[in-house]
Protein backbone atom coordinates (compact mmCIF):
# COMPACT_ATOMS: atom_id res chain seq x y z
CA UNK A 1 0.00 0.00 0.00
CA UNK A 2 1.56 3.37 -1.01
CA UNK A 3 2.23 5.60 1.99
CA UNK A 4 0.34 8.91 2.12
CA UNK A 5 2.74 11.78 1.43
CA UNK A 6 2.21 15.44 2.31
CA UNK A 7 1.86 17.58 -0.82
CA UNK A 8 3.56 20.95 -0.47
CA UNK A 9 3.15 23.97 -2.74
CA UNK A 10 6.82 24.41 -3.60
CA UNK A 11 9.15 22.41 -5.85
CA UNK A 12 10.69 19.27 -4.40
CA UNK A 13 14.30 18.64 -3.45
CA UNK A 14 16.74 19.30 -6.28
CA UNK A 15 17.54 16.03 -8.04
CA UNK A 16 20.82 14.41 -7.01
CA UNK A 17 20.89 16.74 -3.97
CA UNK A 18 23.29 14.63 -1.80
CA UNK A 19 25.71 14.14 -4.69
CA UNK A 20 25.55 17.85 -5.59
CA UNK A 21 26.29 19.03 -2.05
CA UNK A 22 29.17 16.57 -1.67
CA UNK A 23 30.66 17.45 -5.07
CA UNK A 24 30.39 21.19 -4.37
CA UNK A 25 32.08 20.73 -1.01
CA UNK A 26 34.98 18.82 -2.56
CA UNK A 27 35.37 21.41 -5.32
CA UNK A 28 35.26 24.35 -2.88
CA UNK A 29 37.80 22.86 -0.49
CA UNK A 30 40.15 22.13 -3.39
CA UNK A 31 39.96 25.72 -4.65
CA UNK A 32 40.19 27.41 -1.21
CA UNK A 33 43.32 26.30 0.67
CA UNK A 34 42.09 27.76 3.97
CA UNK A 35 39.20 25.23 3.89
CA UNK A 36 41.26 22.16 2.93
CA UNK A 37 40.88 20.77 6.46
CA UNK A 38 37.12 20.38 6.00
CA UNK A 39 35.85 16.79 5.84
CA UNK A 40 33.11 16.90 3.20
CA UNK A 41 31.48 13.65 4.31
CA UNK A 42 31.03 15.15 7.79
CA UNK A 43 29.65 18.32 6.20
CA UNK A 44 27.08 16.30 4.28
CA UNK A 45 26.16 14.29 7.38
CA UNK A 46 25.61 17.52 9.34
CA UNK A 47 23.60 19.05 6.48
CA UNK A 48 21.43 15.93 6.21
CA UNK A 49 21.02 15.82 9.99
CA UNK A 50 19.48 19.29 9.96
CA UNK A 51 16.35 18.24 8.05
CA UNK A 52 16.10 14.46 7.59
CA UNK A 53 13.31 12.79 9.66
CA UNK A 54 12.07 16.22 10.76
CA UNK A 55 8.80 17.88 9.90
CA UNK A 56 9.68 20.35 7.11
CA UNK A 57 7.64 23.10 8.72
CA UNK A 58 9.31 22.72 12.08
CA UNK A 59 12.99 23.39 11.33
CA UNK A 60 14.97 25.65 13.67
CA UNK A 61 18.29 27.45 13.50
CA UNK A 62 19.44 25.02 16.18
CA UNK A 63 19.06 22.18 13.69
CA UNK A 64 21.74 23.77 11.54
CA UNK A 65 24.27 24.42 14.31
CA UNK A 66 26.40 21.29 13.66
CA UNK A 67 26.66 22.34 9.98
CA UNK A 68 27.45 25.94 10.93
CA UNK A 69 30.25 24.72 13.17
CA UNK A 70 31.82 22.57 10.46
CA UNK A 71 31.49 25.38 7.90
CA UNK A 72 33.02 28.09 10.09
CA UNK A 73 35.03 30.34 7.82
CA UNK A 74 36.81 33.66 8.22
CA UNK A 75 36.31 36.13 5.39
CA UNK A 76 37.79 39.66 5.53
CA UNK A 77 35.07 41.44 7.47
CA UNK A 78 35.59 44.72 5.56
CA UNK A 79 35.17 43.09 2.13
CA UNK A 80 31.58 41.89 2.38
CA UNK A 81 29.05 42.45 -0.40
CA UNK A 82 25.40 41.87 0.44
CA UNK A 83 22.78 41.85 -2.33
CA UNK A 84 19.03 41.87 -2.77
CA UNK A 85 17.18 40.68 -5.87
CA UNK A 86 20.31 41.03 -8.04
CA UNK A 87 22.32 37.92 -7.32
CA UNK A 88 23.84 37.36 -10.78
CA UNK A 89 25.47 40.79 -11.01
CA UNK A 90 26.74 40.53 -7.42
CA UNK A 91 28.40 37.21 -8.28
CA UNK A 92 29.83 38.56 -11.54
CA UNK A 93 31.28 41.44 -9.53
CA UNK A 94 33.04 39.24 -6.94
CA UNK A 95 34.46 37.15 -9.79
CA UNK A 96 36.17 40.34 -11.00
CA UNK A 97 36.92 41.95 -7.62
CA UNK A 98 38.37 38.79 -6.11
CA UNK A 99 39.01 40.26 -2.67
CA UNK A 100 35.30 40.85 -2.03
CA UNK A 101 32.82 38.19 -0.94
CA UNK A 102 29.12 37.50 -1.20
CA UNK A 103 27.54 34.86 1.03
CA UNK A 104 27.64 32.45 -1.92
CA UNK A 105 31.43 32.85 -2.11
CA UNK A 106 31.66 31.18 1.32
CA UNK A 107 31.55 27.40 1.70
CA UNK A 108 28.04 27.17 3.17
CA UNK A 109 26.55 29.64 0.69
CA UNK A 110 28.26 27.88 -2.19
CA UNK A 111 26.93 24.47 -1.11
CA UNK A 112 23.29 25.56 -1.03
CA UNK A 113 23.10 28.19 -3.80
CA UNK A 114 20.03 27.60 -6.03
CA UNK A 115 19.19 24.28 -4.36
CA UNK A 116 15.97 23.13 -2.67
CA UNK A 117 15.69 20.39 -0.06
CA UNK A 118 13.36 18.93 2.54
CA UNK A 119 12.62 15.67 4.31
CA UNK A 120 9.62 14.05 5.94
CA UNK A 121 8.70 13.58 9.57
CA UNK A 122 9.76 10.20 10.94
CA UNK A 123 11.26 8.81 7.72
CA UNK A 124 14.83 9.02 6.50
CA UNK A 125 13.63 9.87 2.98
CA UNK A 126 14.38 13.05 1.09
CA UNK A 127 11.24 14.51 -0.51
CA UNK A 128 11.89 14.95 -4.22
CA UNK A 129 8.20 15.59 -5.02
CA UNK A 130 7.47 18.83 -3.15
CA UNK A 131 8.77 21.06 -0.36
CA UNK A 132 7.04 23.79 1.66
CA UNK A 133 6.69 27.19 0.05
CA UNK A 134 7.60 30.08 2.35
CA UNK A 135 4.34 31.97 1.68
CA UNK A 136 1.81 29.25 0.92
CA UNK A 137 2.94 26.63 3.44
CA UNK A 138 5.31 27.72 6.22
CA UNK A 139 8.32 29.95 6.88
CA UNK A 140 10.20 27.50 9.12
CA UNK A 141 11.09 25.20 6.23
CA UNK A 142 14.61 23.76 5.71
CA UNK A 143 15.66 26.13 2.93
CA UNK A 144 14.35 29.35 4.49
CA UNK A 145 15.78 28.56 7.91
CA UNK A 146 19.16 27.70 6.37
CA UNK A 147 19.39 31.03 4.51
CA UNK A 148 18.15 32.97 7.52
CA UNK A 149 20.84 31.31 9.68
CA UNK A 150 23.79 31.79 7.32
CA UNK A 151 22.67 35.33 6.36
CA UNK A 152 22.46 36.38 9.99
CA UNK A 153 25.94 35.02 10.71
CA UNK A 154 27.37 36.65 7.58
CA UNK A 155 25.93 40.06 8.53
CA UNK A 156 27.13 39.70 12.13
CA UNK A 157 30.68 39.12 10.88
CA UNK A 158 30.79 42.30 8.76
CA UNK A 159 32.86 45.35 9.74
CA UNK A 160 33.97 48.82 8.53
CA UNK A 161 32.25 49.61 5.20
CA UNK A 162 29.64 47.03 4.21
CA UNK A 163 28.38 47.11 0.62
CA UNK A 164 24.97 46.08 -0.65
CA UNK A 165 23.88 45.78 -4.27
CA UNK A 166 20.21 46.60 -4.86
CA UNK A 167 18.04 46.19 -7.96
CA UNK A 168 16.92 49.62 -9.18
CA UNK A 169 14.47 48.04 -11.67
CA UNK A 170 12.16 46.72 -8.95
CA UNK A 171 9.20 48.62 -7.53
CA UNK A 172 10.71 48.25 -4.06
CA UNK A 173 14.43 48.87 -4.50
CA UNK A 174 14.80 48.17 -0.80
CA UNK A 175 12.33 45.55 0.38
CA UNK A 176 11.89 45.11 4.13
CA UNK A 177 10.68 41.56 3.52
CA UNK A 178 13.77 40.41 1.62
CA UNK A 179 16.53 38.49 3.39
CA UNK A 180 18.61 41.66 3.28
CA UNK A 181 15.78 43.79 4.70
CA UNK A 182 14.51 41.36 7.32
CA UNK A 183 17.71 39.63 8.46
CA UNK A 184 20.98 41.21 7.35
CA UNK A 185 20.15 44.88 8.00
CA UNK A 186 19.18 44.08 11.60
CA UNK A 187 22.24 41.96 12.29
CA UNK A 188 24.95 44.40 11.23
CA UNK A 189 26.87 45.26 14.40
CA UNK A 190 27.02 49.05 15.00
CA UNK A 191 30.14 48.69 17.14
CA UNK A 192 31.95 47.13 14.15
CA UNK A 193 30.21 48.57 11.07
CA UNK A 194 30.90 52.20 10.27
CA UNK A 195 28.99 52.58 6.99
CA UNK A 196 26.52 50.71 4.83
CA UNK A 197 27.12 51.66 1.21
CA UNK A 198 24.25 50.86 -1.15
CA UNK A 199 24.84 50.42 -4.88
CA UNK A 200 21.60 50.91 -6.81
CA UNK A 201 21.83 49.11 -10.14
CA UNK A 202 19.94 50.78 -12.99
CA UNK A 203 18.18 48.66 -15.60
CA UNK A 204 17.31 51.07 -18.42
CA UNK A 205 19.92 52.23 -20.92
CA UNK A 206 18.92 55.88 -20.68
CA UNK A 207 17.90 55.97 -17.04
CA UNK A 208 19.74 58.89 -15.46
CA UNK A 209 17.46 59.35 -12.44
CA UNK A 210 19.04 59.48 -9.02
CA UNK A 211 17.57 56.31 -7.56
CA UNK A 212 19.33 57.04 -4.27
CA UNK A 213 16.43 59.45 -3.67
CA UNK A 214 13.87 56.63 -3.98
CA UNK A 215 11.50 56.45 -0.96
CA UNK A 216 12.53 52.87 -0.16
CA UNK A 217 16.21 53.89 -0.10
CA UNK A 218 15.29 56.73 2.27
CA UNK A 219 13.54 54.11 4.41
CA UNK A 220 16.73 51.99 4.41
CA UNK A 221 18.77 55.07 5.33
CA UNK A 222 16.42 55.76 8.24
CA UNK A 223 16.64 52.16 9.56
CA UNK A 224 20.44 52.17 9.28
CA UNK A 225 20.86 55.62 10.83
CA UNK A 226 18.70 54.62 13.80
CA UNK A 227 21.15 51.77 14.36
CA UNK A 228 24.03 54.29 14.56
CA UNK A 229 25.53 53.19 11.24
CA UNK A 230 26.31 55.74 8.56
CA UNK A 231 24.69 55.34 5.14
CA UNK A 232 25.89 56.19 1.67
CA UNK A 233 24.40 55.42 -1.72
CA UNK A 234 25.73 55.27 -5.27
CA UNK A 235 23.92 54.92 -8.57
CA UNK A 236 25.38 52.44 -11.03
CA UNK A 237 23.85 53.64 -14.28
CA UNK A 238 25.64 51.14 -16.52
CA UNK A 239 26.19 47.77 -14.83
CA UNK A 240 28.02 46.35 -17.87
CA UNK A 241 30.40 49.31 -17.86
CA UNK A 242 30.75 49.05 -14.09
CA UNK A 243 32.09 45.50 -14.31
CA UNK A 244 34.42 46.45 -17.16
CA UNK A 245 35.77 49.43 -15.19
CA UNK A 246 36.27 47.43 -11.98
CA UNK A 247 38.42 45.13 -14.14
CA UNK A 248 40.32 48.03 -15.72
CA UNK A 249 39.80 51.34 -13.89
CA UNK A 250 42.43 53.15 -15.99
CA UNK A 251 40.59 52.62 -19.27
CA UNK A 252 39.69 55.98 -20.87
CA UNK A 253 36.02 55.00 -21.10
CA UNK A 254 35.92 54.63 -17.29
CA UNK A 255 36.61 58.25 -16.36
CA UNK A 256 33.05 59.55 -16.75
CA UNK A 257 29.86 58.45 -14.99
CA UNK A 258 29.32 54.72 -14.77
Amino acid sequence: VPRWRQQWSGPGTTKRFPETVLARCVKYTEIHPEMRHVDCQSVWDAFKGAFISKHPCNITEEDYQPLMKLGTQTVPCNKILLWSRIKDLAHQFTQVQRDMFTLEDTLLGYLADDLTWCGEFNTSKINYQSCPDWRKDCSNNPVSVFWKTVSRRFAEAACDVVHVMLNGSRSKIFDKNSTFGSVEVHNLQPEKVQTLEAWVIHGGREDSRDLCQDPTIKELESIISKRNIQFSCKNIYRPDKFLQCVKNPEDSSCTSEI
Epitope: N78, K79, M100, V161, H163, E197, P249, T255, E257, I258
Partner: nanobody, 123 residues
Protein backbone atom coordinates in the same frame (compact mmCIF):
# COMPACT_ATOMS: atom_id res chain seq x y z
CA UNK B 1 35.69 65.06 5.75
CA UNK B 2 37.26 68.06 4.01
CA UNK B 3 39.32 68.39 0.83
CA UNK B 4 41.13 71.55 -0.24
CA UNK B 5 42.66 71.84 -3.74
CA UNK B 6 45.18 74.51 -4.69
CA UNK B 7 48.00 75.27 -7.12
CA UNK B 8 46.11 76.21 -10.27
CA UNK B 9 47.03 79.14 -12.44
CA UNK B 10 47.81 80.39 -15.93
CA UNK B 11 50.55 78.55 -17.81
CA UNK B 12 51.78 78.43 -21.39
CA UNK B 13 51.36 75.36 -23.60
CA UNK B 14 54.15 72.89 -22.94
CA UNK B 15 54.54 74.14 -19.36
CA UNK B 16 53.97 72.41 -16.02
CA UNK B 17 51.98 72.89 -12.83
CA UNK B 18 51.76 71.04 -9.54
CA UNK B 19 48.36 70.86 -7.85
CA UNK B 20 47.96 70.03 -4.15
CA UNK B 21 45.04 68.58 -2.24
CA UNK B 22 44.88 68.48 1.55
CA UNK B 23 42.60 65.78 2.97
CA UNK B 24 41.29 65.78 6.55
CA UNK B 25 38.62 64.02 8.57
CA UNK B 26 39.29 60.37 7.80
CA UNK B 27 40.00 58.26 10.87
CA UNK B 28 41.71 55.43 8.96
CA UNK B 29 43.27 54.66 5.57
CA UNK B 30 40.06 53.07 4.30
CA UNK B 31 39.51 55.54 1.48
CA UNK B 32 40.51 56.45 -2.05
CA UNK B 33 41.41 60.01 -3.10
CA UNK B 34 41.24 61.11 -6.72
CA UNK B 35 41.82 64.00 -9.12
CA UNK B 36 39.18 65.17 -11.59
CA UNK B 37 38.67 68.00 -14.01
CA UNK B 38 35.79 69.74 -15.71
CA UNK B 39 36.29 71.84 -18.81
CA UNK B 40 33.63 74.38 -19.86
CA UNK B 41 30.63 72.64 -21.40
CA UNK B 42 32.03 69.16 -20.74
CA UNK B 43 31.31 66.48 -18.12
CA UNK B 44 33.59 65.98 -15.16
CA UNK B 45 36.40 63.53 -15.95
CA UNK B 46 38.51 61.27 -13.72
CA UNK B 47 42.29 61.65 -14.06
CA UNK B 48 43.99 59.64 -11.33
CA UNK B 49 43.47 58.24 -7.87
CA UNK B 50 45.29 56.71 -4.95
CA UNK B 51 43.87 53.82 -2.93
CA UNK B 52 45.07 54.44 0.62
CA UNK B 53 44.24 50.83 1.47
CA UNK B 54 47.05 49.39 -0.65
CA UNK B 55 49.00 52.51 -1.68
CA UNK B 56 48.37 51.94 -5.39
CA UNK B 57 48.06 54.80 -7.88
CA UNK B 58 45.79 54.62 -10.92
CA UNK B 59 46.04 56.99 -13.90
CA UNK B 60 43.55 57.33 -16.72
CA UNK B 61 45.04 56.17 -20.02
CA UNK B 62 44.08 59.55 -21.49
CA UNK B 63 46.62 61.43 -19.30
CA UNK B 64 49.15 58.69 -18.49
CA UNK B 65 52.68 59.90 -19.18
CA UNK B 66 51.76 63.59 -18.80
CA UNK B 67 49.97 63.71 -15.42
CA UNK B 68 51.40 62.02 -12.33
CA UNK B 69 49.78 61.70 -8.93
CA UNK B 70 51.88 61.43 -5.78
CA UNK B 71 51.47 61.63 -2.02
CA UNK B 72 53.45 63.00 0.89
CA UNK B 73 54.70 60.79 3.71
CA UNK B 74 52.31 61.99 6.39
CA UNK B 75 49.45 61.06 4.07
CA UNK B 76 47.29 64.15 4.36
CA UNK B 77 48.31 65.75 1.06
CA UNK B 78 48.23 64.41 -2.48
CA UNK B 79 49.63 66.09 -5.58
CA UNK B 80 48.97 66.08 -9.29
CA UNK B 81 51.95 66.99 -11.46
CA UNK B 82 50.75 68.33 -14.81
CA UNK B 83 53.41 68.25 -17.56
CA UNK B 84 53.40 69.01 -21.30
CA UNK B 85 50.21 71.01 -20.83
CA UNK B 86 47.96 71.73 -23.83
CA UNK B 87 45.22 74.34 -24.28
CA UNK B 88 42.56 71.62 -24.02
CA UNK B 89 43.79 70.82 -20.50
CA UNK B 90 42.14 74.10 -19.48
CA UNK B 91 39.58 73.21 -16.81
CA UNK B 92 38.68 73.42 -13.15
CA UNK B 93 40.61 70.66 -11.33
CA UNK B 94 39.04 69.00 -8.28
CA UNK B 95 40.10 66.45 -5.70
CA UNK B 96 37.58 64.06 -4.19
CA UNK B 97 37.45 61.02 -1.92
CA UNK B 98 35.39 57.89 -1.39
CA UNK B 99 35.27 55.27 1.35
CA UNK B 100 34.30 52.57 -1.15
CA UNK B 101 36.70 49.64 -1.34
CA UNK B 102 36.19 49.56 -5.10
CA UNK B 103 38.70 51.69 -7.01
CA UNK B 104 37.15 53.61 -9.89
CA UNK B 105 37.89 56.91 -11.64
CA UNK B 106 34.21 57.66 -12.32
CA UNK B 107 33.20 60.98 -10.67
CA UNK B 108 29.84 59.60 -9.45
CA UNK B 109 31.76 57.07 -7.33
CA UNK B 110 33.12 59.80 -5.03
CA UNK B 111 31.06 61.25 -2.19
CA UNK B 112 33.40 63.92 -0.77
CA UNK B 113 34.52 66.86 -2.95
CA UNK B 114 36.77 69.85 -2.49
CA UNK B 115 36.30 73.14 -4.23
CA UNK B 116 38.13 73.35 -7.58
CA UNK B 117 41.29 75.14 -8.67
CA UNK B 118 41.34 76.75 -12.13
CA UNK B 119 44.04 75.73 -14.62
CA UNK B 120 44.30 77.80 -17.80
CA UNK B 121 46.70 76.83 -20.57
CA UNK B 122 47.36 79.50 -23.18
CA UNK B 123 48.73 78.81 -26.64
Amino acid sequence: VQLQASGGGLVQAGGSLRLSCTVSGFTSDDYTVGWFRQAPGLKREGLSCLSRRDGRFYHSNSVKGRFTMSSDDNKNTVYLQLDSLKPDDTAVYYCAATTSVVVLLAPNWYEYWGQGTQVTVSS
